[in-house]
Every structure is written in structure tokens, then in C-alpha cells.
């Protein structure tokens, strides 16, 4: 006789579309006409989809909208020439959750809003697996944007200034199709934009533990008191962040107690009672506390009878101020070398000129920083071409 397989005694489902599966074995394998599903009210359902595996017939039923009143005992029934078998199982249909209240706006700026999502109380069934805050500009026909939220208090960033937004909360319960309908909508308007950021911002390393930020003098258009807020954070250590308030009449601030050889991101804004607009991020490294590493990937190319091109790369973060190329005819005295000092560390190639034809040169490279010079591990050899072979 046929046998119904892998059917749990109890299934919890969410209101909405439901695709129960009834799986049966036996010989002959049940055909799709021979498998049915009986609802608690006696309605007989036939499979919408069906497939055979080596040992099983798998019937997939489709209920376009299952409701709480469909809760109760359902029966999977298989009736073949070999016999009939039925397996009752309990389905508990849950109501999708929906917040009863609209979210509350606690605070707004020109580009942010602090929201209490007010996810409780809610109508429907829990437990709540996750929550979404949906938002969009009122006058936009674009789709709702959303963020997943874990706390009741959440900050929405990157909003447009002086714009009306609408907000609502969607609750998601466990199980497939557990997304509830969004709750009531709250409207709010972001603040007008504050003062523009300081102009002419320059961030330069001062020492191993300090950076200096400078800007052009600020001439406010109103009588309001103002100050410059400077935020600095470490790229390497995410938790290392500090905000400094600088009187409005100053045009620089020394950022101290920093770590050597570390990259920092700095931005500034001018605040009155309202917060100003942040500047673009500036980045800089504090000065190094060790000698720099050697230039890497040193290559000598385009060799002629009197010239050659040397190229290299350097590592970021070691406050390298210059590159020195030292070359001399091989075998000549040490003091007969020529030093080329390249003070722009962003340059990564240089053409050596005025070389002798058919001559072997020894080439060394160094990087220099505030501590000293790098130590070359080995020299590079360069052999110029004979005069007649030059292109």
C-alpha cells in the first residue's frame, strides 16, 4: 500500500500564499490524480505541481490565500490500486503582524532624523523575527527605501534637506511569507541646511603624534555664535574617533595624542544653533617612527648608450619625503657616485642621462623620511649599449 512520508504532525504557516507538499511512496508510485489534500472544511484540493523521484511521488498544492479560519486538521490522502492511505496533520495559520502606531520622530537635522519606531504594540501574531523602517520623500514616486532595524531608536542618514518624508514600520515574523503589512505612516520634514563647511581645508602631518588642520577665516553672515567642529577618526582603528570644538575665530587646530605611522580621516563643519554641513573627508598620515622600507619593484628599462629609465613603487604610510637614486661606474671609488634626489614622493620613475656607452653602472635606491634613510639590500646593475647600437 502507499505510504505518506515526511509529513510533520504540526505546521505553522503565515497568512497568504501557501504551498503544502505531500510526499508518498509505494508501488505503483501514486499518480498526480491519486493524491489529494483535504481542508478542515472538507474542500478537496488537487496538486498544482507534481513530480516523481525514484521512490516518491511529490504533490505540491497551491493555496493562494490561507487564512486563520483555515487552521485545523488537514488530511493528505493517497488512493491507488494498491490501497488508500490518509495522514492528518495540524495547520496553525498565523496573522501577519502590523504595528498599531506610527513611528515617532525624536530629532531631525538637515540630512538625518532620529526615529522611535514604536514597533509595539502590534496587531497579529509574534514572535517578531525582524523589523524594517520604510521611508521615502512624500513627493517622490520612487519605491520605498528601507533599513533593517534592531533597536527601537534608529537614525536615518543621507536625507535631503528641507524635504517632507513619510515613514512606516514593517514587522516580519518567522516562517515563509512572514512580512506583515506596513503600519501607520508618519510624516516629517528635514531641517534647512546649516552653514557651509570651512573653505581651504588643509591637513598636514606635524609630528609622529600630531596633525595640523587649517582653513580660511570664517566670516558669518549673522550675529549667531558659531564654532568649528572637527571630527577625526583612525582608518586602522575603527573605534578611535574624536570630535573637537574650535572657537570660530581660529583658523587651525592641532590634532594631538595620535599614533605614529597611522592614517586619519578628518572633516569639519561650522555649527551655530543648527549643525552645519560636513566638509569632504581629508586624509593624512602621522609622521613615521621608523626608517622607511626600501622602494619596491625597481626596474631598469629603455637602456640606450647614454641613458636608462628607472622605475619603482613605494609603500604608503611611512612619511617618505624623497627618493635618492645613487649610481656610479662599477669598480670606481665609493666617493665617485652621483646622487639624484627626487623630492616629490609621488614620482615613480626617472631617466638617468649622460651615461657612458658600453659601461657597467651600479645603481642603488633609498627612500628618506623624517627618521632617516632606508637600507638597500642589494645593488642593481645597469649596462649601457655600445654607441653604434643605440637606436
Amino acid at each position: 500500500t502507499p505510504k505518506i512520508e515526511d509529513l510533520p504532525d504540526h505546521i505553522e504557516v503565515n497568512t497568504g500564499k501557501f504551498n503544502p507538499i505531500c510526499k508518498a511512496s509505494g508501488w505503483p508510485l501514486p499518480a498526480n490524480e491519486e493524491m489529494t489534500l483535504v481542508k478542515p472544511d472538507g474542500t478537496v484540493l488537487h496538486p498544482k505541481d507534481f513530480n516523481h523521484t525514484e521512490n516518491f511521488s511529490v504533490a505540491i498544492f497551491t493555496i493562494h490565500r490561507i487564512l486563520p479560519l483555515d487552521s485545523g486538521v488537514w488530511v493528505c490522502s493517497v488512493n491507488t490500486v494498491a490501497g488508500m492511505v490518509e495522514k492528518p496533520f495540524n495547520i496553525s495559520v498565523k496573522v501577519l503582524p502590523k504595528p498599531l502606531n506610527a513611528p515617532n520622530v525624536i530629532d531631525t537635522g538637515h540630512n538625518f532624523a532620529v526615529i522611535n519606531i514604536s514597533s509595539e504594540p502590534y496587531f497579529g501574531d509574534g514572535p517578531i523575527k525582524s523589523k524594517k523602517l520604510l521611508y521615502k520623500p512624500v513627493n517622490d514616486y520612487e519605491a520605498w527605501r528601507h533599513i533593517q532595524v534592531t533597536n527601537e531608536i534608529v537614525t536615518l542618514n543621507y536625507l535631503e534637506p528641507r524635504t517632507e518624508y513619510e515613514l512606516c514600520v514593517q514587522l516580519i515574523r518567522r516562517g515563509e511569507g512572514g512580512e506583515g503589512h506596513p503600519g501607520p505612516v508618519r510624516r516629517f520634514t528635514t531641517a534647512s541646511i546649516g552653514l557651509p563647511p570651512p573653505q581651504g581645508l588643509i591637513l598636514l602631518p606635524k609630528s609622529q603624534t600630531t596633525l595640523n588642520l587649517t582653513w580660511q577665516p570664517i566670516f558669518p553672515s549673522s550675529e549667531d555664535d558659531f564654532y568649528v567642529e572637527v571630527e577625526r577618526r583612525s582608518v586602522q582603528i575603527k573605534s578611535d574617533q574624536q570630535n573637537i570644538k574650535v572657537p570660530g575665530n581660529l583658523t587651525s587646530v592641532l590634532l594631538n595624542n595620535l599614533h605614529p605611522r597611522e592614517q586619519y580621516v578628518v572633516r569639519a563643519r561650522v555649527n551655530t544653533k543648527a549643525q552645519g554641513e560636513w566638509s569632504e573627508d581629508l586624509t593624512a598620515w602621522t609622521l613615521s617612527d621608523i626608517v622607511p622600507p626600501q622602494p619596491e619593484n625597481i626596474k631598469i628599462s629603455n637602456i640606450t648608450d647614454s641613458s636608462a629609465v628607472i622605475s619603482w613603487t613605494i609603500l604608503d604610510g611611512y612619511s617618505i619625503s624623497s627618493i635618492i637614486i645613487r649610481y656610479k661606474v662599477q669598480g670606481k671609488n665609493e666617493d665617485q657616485h652621483i646622487d639624484v634626489k627626487i623630492k616629490n614622493a609621488t614620482i615613480t620613475q626617472y631617466q638617468l642621462k649622460g651615461l657612458e656607452p658600453e659601461t657597467a653602472y651600479q645603481v642603488d635606491m633609498f627612500a628618506e623620511n623624517n627618521i632617516g634613510s632606508s637600507n638597500p639590500a642589494f645593488s642593481h646593475e645597469l649596462m649601457t649599449l655600445p654607441e653604434s647600437q643605440a637606436p
Epitope: 498526480n32 516523481h52 523521484t53 525514484e54
Partner: antibody, heavy 115, light 107 residues
């Protein structure tokens, strides 16, 4: 007893459309898929697609996607298959067949496409 | 699309003979294969579903089997009403595809 009664033979000109019907009885009409299969003269069978009368969901053979429309009328337990932009190679007997894998078949409708 | 190659395309046999018709699938279709009979002037009839399960009302002389991607319909002892066209159908993946058919004629 399951019965599928199809509409009568049709003669159509190239470029025209034809609509074949299949009236079902003897079972719960909205519970089973209805397939459409055709057979050109002296040729084998070719599956065109199917429709589920409960919600009109259709699953079509890609080959016919642009030219076939399957519909149903639950009040009369009838399924329709319309084939447009007819060409001579569409001359065939068109069958409806009940169930996902065709356990009951109609008697067939001959459609002749000729100028 | 999955191709179903059916052989032979025609077959002459006598009442009482044992006959086999085969279908080879171009790729794995598991047991998702049916066999159909088409008699002139009659509705097409499903004989076997899921490779080897006999439809109700179909005589036991019909049987189906499988070896890898080769599927066989066997009629153990031909009767006069068995002379007809036979088709296999794979339903493992859409579009469903039929074999080219086998015409079983009286010798």
C-alpha cells in the same frame, strides 16, 4: 467519466488566427492543468503549453511564447487556445489533454492553414 | 530542450509476439517519463507514467523499465488491439518533449 470535447475543424489563411476550444466534464474543472499538444500530418506530438483553470496560470513552450494565448471560462468549464500569425507549418491536429502529464485527451481539432 | 530519441520508428509484428520500444533521453530525466498509445480514430491514451507505473485499466501485458537514460516499453504478448502508434513523453523539465513515435503494424 472524464470527457474533453473539442471544437470542429478550421481552415485559415496564413497570417490569420485560430481559436480552438476544449469543453471539460466529469471532474473538477479548476483542479487540473489543461495541456495543448499538436500533431502535424504524419508527424509526432509537440507540447505547446498548459493552463491551470483555477488562476489562469500558463506555462508555455518557449517556441510558441509569442503566438499562443491560453484562456479559460470557468462558467462553462472550457479552455481555449488561440494561435496567431498562422503559417502553413501550423497545419496540424490540436489536442487538449487533462492533468500535468496528460492522462485524458480530447478527440483533436484539425486546423488547416492554406492560401 | 531535452531530446527524446525513439526507436524503432516502425515495427511489424504478429499477435502473440513480444515487442519492445525504446526512448533515449539526451540528459538525465530520472523516472519522469510516460508512454502513450494512439489508435486511429480514438483519443490518445496514457499507458504508463513515472517510467514503470501502469495506468488503471491498462492490461498487464504492458510494462515499462529504465536503464540509465534508456527507457523501454514492453508488450509481452501482442493482441490485435495493440496495433497503434506509441509515444514517450519526458516531463522532467519544460518544455515537455515527446519521442518521434513508433508505428506498430501487423506483419
Amino acid at each position: 467519466e472524464v470527457q474533453l470535447v473539442q471544437s470542429g475543424a478550421e481552415v485559415k489563411k496564413p497570417g490569420a488566427s485560430v481559436k480552438v476550444s476544449c469543453k471539460a466534464s466529469g471532474y473538477s474543472f479548476t483542479s487540473y492543468w489543461m495541456n495543448w499538444v499538436r500533431q502535424a500530418p504524419g508527424q509526432g506530438l509537440e507540447w505547446m503549453g498548459m493552463i491551470h483553470p483555477s488562476d489562469s496560470e500558463t506555462r508555455l513552450n518557449q517556441k510558441f511564447m509569442d503566438r499562443v494565448t491560453m484562456t479559460r471560462d470557468t462558467s462553462t468549464s472550457t479552455v481555449y487556445m488561440e494561435l496567431s500569425s498562422l503559417r502553413s507549418e501550423d497545419t496540424a491536429v490540436y489536442y487538449c489533454a487533462r492533468g500535468l502529464y496528460g492522462n485524458s485527451w480530447g478527440q483533436g481539432t484539425l486546423v488547416t492553414v492554406s492560401s | 530542450d531535452i531530446q527524446m530519441t525513439q526507436s524503432p520508428s516502425s515495427l511489424s509484428a504478429s499477435v502473440g509476439d513480444r515487442v519492445t520500444i525504446t526512448c533515449r533521453a539526451s540528459q538525465d530525466i530520472g523516472i519522469s517519463l510516460n508512454w502513450y498509445q494512439q489508435e486511429p480514430g480514438k483519443a490518445i491514451k496514457r499507458l504508463i507514467y513515472a517510467t514503470s507505473s501502469l495506468d488503471s485499466g491498462v492490461p498487464k501485458r504492458f510494462s515499462g523499465s529504465r536503464s540509465g537514460t534508456e527507457y523501454t516499453l514492453t508488450i509481452s504478448s501482442l493482441e490485435s488491439e495493440d496495433f497503434a502508434d506509441y509515444y514517450c513523453l519526458q516531463y522532467a523539465s519544460s518544455p515537455y518533449t515527446f519521442g518521434g513515435g513508433t508505428k506498430l503494424e501487423i506483419k
